[in-house]
Amino acid sequence: PRNDTCPELPEIPNGWKSPSQPELVHGTVVTYQCYPGYQVVGSSVLMCQWDLTWSEDLPSCQRVTSCHDPGDVEHSRRLISSPKFPVGATVQYICDQGFVLMGSSILTCHDRQAGSPKWSDRAPKCLLEQLKPCHGLSAPENGARSPEKQLHPAGATIHFSCAPGYVLKGQASIKCVPGHPSHWSDPPPICRAASLDGFYNSRSLDVAKAPAASSTLDAAH
């Protein structure tokens, strides 16, 4: 054996080194990699040092027995059967209220003949629920509504007003409350004649004495 080189580096089971035929002189760097389904244990990079020893111990290739963490999904919570995600582990995603699941709710970590274990599916998404709109209300008689649409999205507000000489009885603005189904926050108002209101609420009927009867009046009637 030469005394001006580092010792030869062997191949490792389930992996390879590059370069495959390295010069063993000082400064040479050798990288070990593993076949699919295996991961490097130890240092994958070794360097031939001044003292003609390798900088690290020889690594090994160990079978990968778990899946990577599939991650959190926005607007959801997740239930994990095993913290390190070994083969057979499940992750269940449950969307928060107001969100709907797109994709698979439960992922399972499966082993593969060649390659690392893999999740049964990609992580799902939780999308904002599309709430049904409220149907448009007709304008009150002798009044108007704004906006004059057939459908109003959840959260929208409509406003009511009355024609001159009429007053609004009820809510001037009502909201389309989000839900399943969405619904109006109040019944639509009505427009009542202002004079009638005043008449019934604050007046009494005055009876005036009729003038003495005459043939002229009789003829007029």
């Epitope: 607007h75 959801s76 919570r77 239930l79 994990i80 059967s81 499940t90 992750v91 269940q92 449950i94 928060d96 209220q97 107001g98 709710s105 439960i106 629920e129 409350v177 989000p178 839900g179 399943h180």
Partner: antibody, heavy 120, light 106 residues
Framework: EVQLQQSGPELMKPGASVKMSCKAS????????MHWVKQNQGKSLEWIGE????????GYNQKFKDKATLTVDKSSSTAYMELRSLTSEDSAVYYC?????????????WGQGTTLTVSS | QIVLTQSPAIMSASPGEKVTMTCSAS?????MHWYQQKSGTSPKRWIY???KLASGVPARFTGSGSGTSYSLTISSMEAEDAATYYC?????????FGAGTKLELK
């Protein structure tokens, strides 16, 4: 009739661990996740976490991740919660509770509660 | 996490009186749920999905609200309504509860 029967009161020393149980009856145990809720002396309620009895999958409120461990025994339709490294802060009433389905977000059935007192 | 603030913390009402308590969320939520709890017993589901009454809950109770503001109203107070009421949301995990409103009979 759905019932969640919880184990009796516990008096524990600081630093100890305690395991309480919740036996379900009146429904198929594996069809519903089991949840645990803490109610402290100040009366406020806090969600601890939940377990899927089918898969054994658990989800925790970050606050209780290092405090509670949830498990189930499917054969006896019983859910368990273990609390470790007990302090006086853990003195509270602990409830197991169920939600009607995965697409429901409120608790429809509650156990009667297990009172935990931590005192030296 | 979303913080729910209930007000008032304590209130009292005479029989027949109208009662309103509120629950304010630190961020917008899509629904609110309410529980009734009497001393020494576990909470009972009372109102769910903002406005739906749980079975057995009298029609004098109503729930309403949207966004960050929700309320529970009793149209005419009765002695059996004296209890603590908690609001709860799950529009964002983890689910959170309000600190409760204690309703007493005057």
């Amino acid at each position: 009739e759905v019932q969640l029967q919880q184990s009796g009161p516990e008096l524990m020393k600081p630093g100890a661990s305690v395991k309480m149980s919740c036996k379900a009856s009146g429904y198929t145990f594996t069809d519903y996740n089991m949840h645990w809720v803490k109610q402290n002396q100040g009366k406020s309620l806090e969600w601890i976490g939940e377990i899927n009895p089918n898969t054994g999958g658990t989800g925790y409120n970050q606050k209780f991740k290092d405090k509670a461990t949830l498990t189930v025994d499917k054969s006896s339709s019983t859910a368990y919660m273990e609390l470790r490294s007990l302090t006086s802060e853990d003195s509270a009433v602990y409830y197991c509770a169920r939600i009607p389905s995965l697409r429901r977000y409120y608790f429809d059935y509650w156990g009667q509660g297990t009172t935990l007192t931590v005192s030296s | 996490q979303i913080v729910l603030t209930q007000s008032p913390a304590i209130m009292s009402a005479s029989p027949g009186e109208k009662v309103t308590m509120t629950c304010s969320a630190s961020s917008s939520v899509s629904y609110m749920h309410w529980y009734q709890q009497k001393s020494g017993t576990s909470p009972k589901r009372w109102i769910y999905d903002t406005s739906k009454l749980a079975s057995g809950v009298p029609a004098r109770f109503t729930g309403s609200g949207s966004g960050t503001s929700y309320s529970l109203t009793i149209s005419s107070m009765e002695a059996e309504d004296a209890a603590t009421y908690y609001c709860q949301q799950w529009s964002s995990s983890p689910p959170t509860f309000g600190a409760g409103t204690k309703l007493e009979l005057k």
